[in-house]
């Protein structure tokens, strides 16, 4: 029984490789999936000597390890690309690295959007 799941319909979208892949660079993504399947948001990034380089953000297909995650938290120690997923609209706006070995928690806030 999937109890109390946060339904995901929209995620923050970002693609660092947008020119090569001929997509938008950033925005919102409306999630589409098969009936009865859950949807999630995700974020992926690199950390080069403390400098965060966002790779991609968007919708993520039904994945059991993402169920019931309200926040986007990566736990791998030192991967090439950090990954987190979560449930709930725009839950991937901010993302966190909380290493399993008990290192410091680092949360990455999105830059404030300039007023138009």
């Amino acid at each position: 029984s999937g109890r109390g799941e946060a339904e995901t319909r929209e995620c923050i979208y970002y693609n660092a490789n947008w020119e090569l892949e001929r997509t938008n660079q950033s925005g919102l993504e409306r999630c589409e999936g098969e009936q009865d399947k859950r949807l999630h948001c995700y974020a992926s990034w690199r950390n080069s000597s403390g400098t965060i380089e966002l790779v991609k953000k968007g919708c993520w297909l039904d994945d059991f390890n993402c169920y019931d995650r309200q926040e986007c938290v990566a736990t791998e120690e030192n991967p090439q690309v950090y990954f987190c997923c979560c449930e709930g609209n725009f839950c991937n706006e901010r993302f966190t690295h909380l290493p399993e070995a008990g290192g410091p928690e680092v949360t990455y806030e999105p830059p404030p959007t300039a007023p138009t």
Epitope: D36, D62, D63, V73, E100
Partner: antibody, heavy 118, light 111 residues
Framework: EVQLLESGGGLVQPGGSLRLSCAAS????????MAWVRQAPGKGLEWVSG????????FYTDSVKGRFTVSRDNSRNTLYLQMNSLRAEDTAVYYC???????????WGQGTLVTVSS | QTVVTQEPSFSVSPGGTVTLTCGFN?????????PSWYQQTPGQAPRTLIY???TRSSGVPDRFSGSILGNKAALTITGAQADDESDYYC??????????FGGGTKLTVLG
């Protein structure tokens, strides 16, 4: 090193109950979904149950629905499978498995044997 | 009821190549089912070989590879060795909390 150690198996009569435990170490248990998989003697693997990181979502194969209950205690790094109204066809080795992103089983325990017989 | 099908048995000569397949009765297997493959020798726990269609698990030799072939998931073993003689299981993630295992393939390495 990731380790999953099942316990609680044994011989039980039809209609009886058992509670299996899976003690996890070597990783942050609360960060990963978990599953139970079983294998009847001389047969193939069969997924039994899965539980999300918080325990808020639980799922079962049809043949055990209403009889088995999966749970987890993240403070004790332990996964459980409460098995009630056991039947002869539940006789199997029960494995616990850690679930990783893209929904695969990346680590397995060594299993515990459950025998249902009169 | 979803049924996942594998060849019940397969034989390969040492050094040869074998491809095991994994299909199901409800249509084509695609990457969205996150097909994964496991090796099991008698009396042992399963060992993870391939996940997410084609990603090798840590420590798995590159003789093992995964793919989608037509409408099925496939596991290919190139340069088969005697200790590859095992049972091989595929698993499909159906979503909504449900996995389905194939019936397994018993691989015999001849000679």
């Amino acid at each position: 090193e990731v380790q999953l150690l099942e316990s609680g198996g044994g011989l039980v009569q039809p209609g009886g109950s058992l509670r299996l435990s899976c003690a996890a170490s070597g990783f942050t248990f609360r960060n990963y979904a978990m599953a139970w998989v079983r294998q009847a003697p001389g047969k193939g693997l069969e997924w039994v149950s899965g539980i999300s990181v918080t325990g808020g979502s639980t799922f079962y194969t049809d043949s055990v629905k209403g009889r088995f209950t999966v749970s987890r205690d993240n403070s004790r790094n332990t996964l459980y499978l409460q098995m009630n109204s056991l039947r002869a066809e539940d006789t199997a080795v029960y494995y616990c498995a850690k679930v990783y992103y893209t929904s695969f089983f990346d680590y397995w325990g060594q299993g515990t044997l459950v025998t249902v017989s009169s | 009821q979803t049924v996942v099908t594998q060849e019940p048995s397969f034989s390969v000569s040492p050094g040869g190549t074998v491809t095991l397949t994994c299909g199901f009765n409800s249509g084509s297997v695609s990457t969205s089912y996150y097909p994964s493959w496991y090796q099991q020798t008698p009396g042992q726990a399963p060992r993870t070989l391939i996940y997410n269609t084609n990603t090798r698990s840590s420590g798995v030799p590159d003789r093992f590879s995964g793919s989608i072939l037509g409408n099925k998931a496939a596991l290919t073993i190139t340069g088969a060795q005697a200790d590859d003689e095992s049972d091989y299981y595929c698993v499909l993630w159906m979503g909504s909390g449900i996995w389905v295992f194939g019936g397994g393939t018993k691989l015999t390495v001849l000679g």
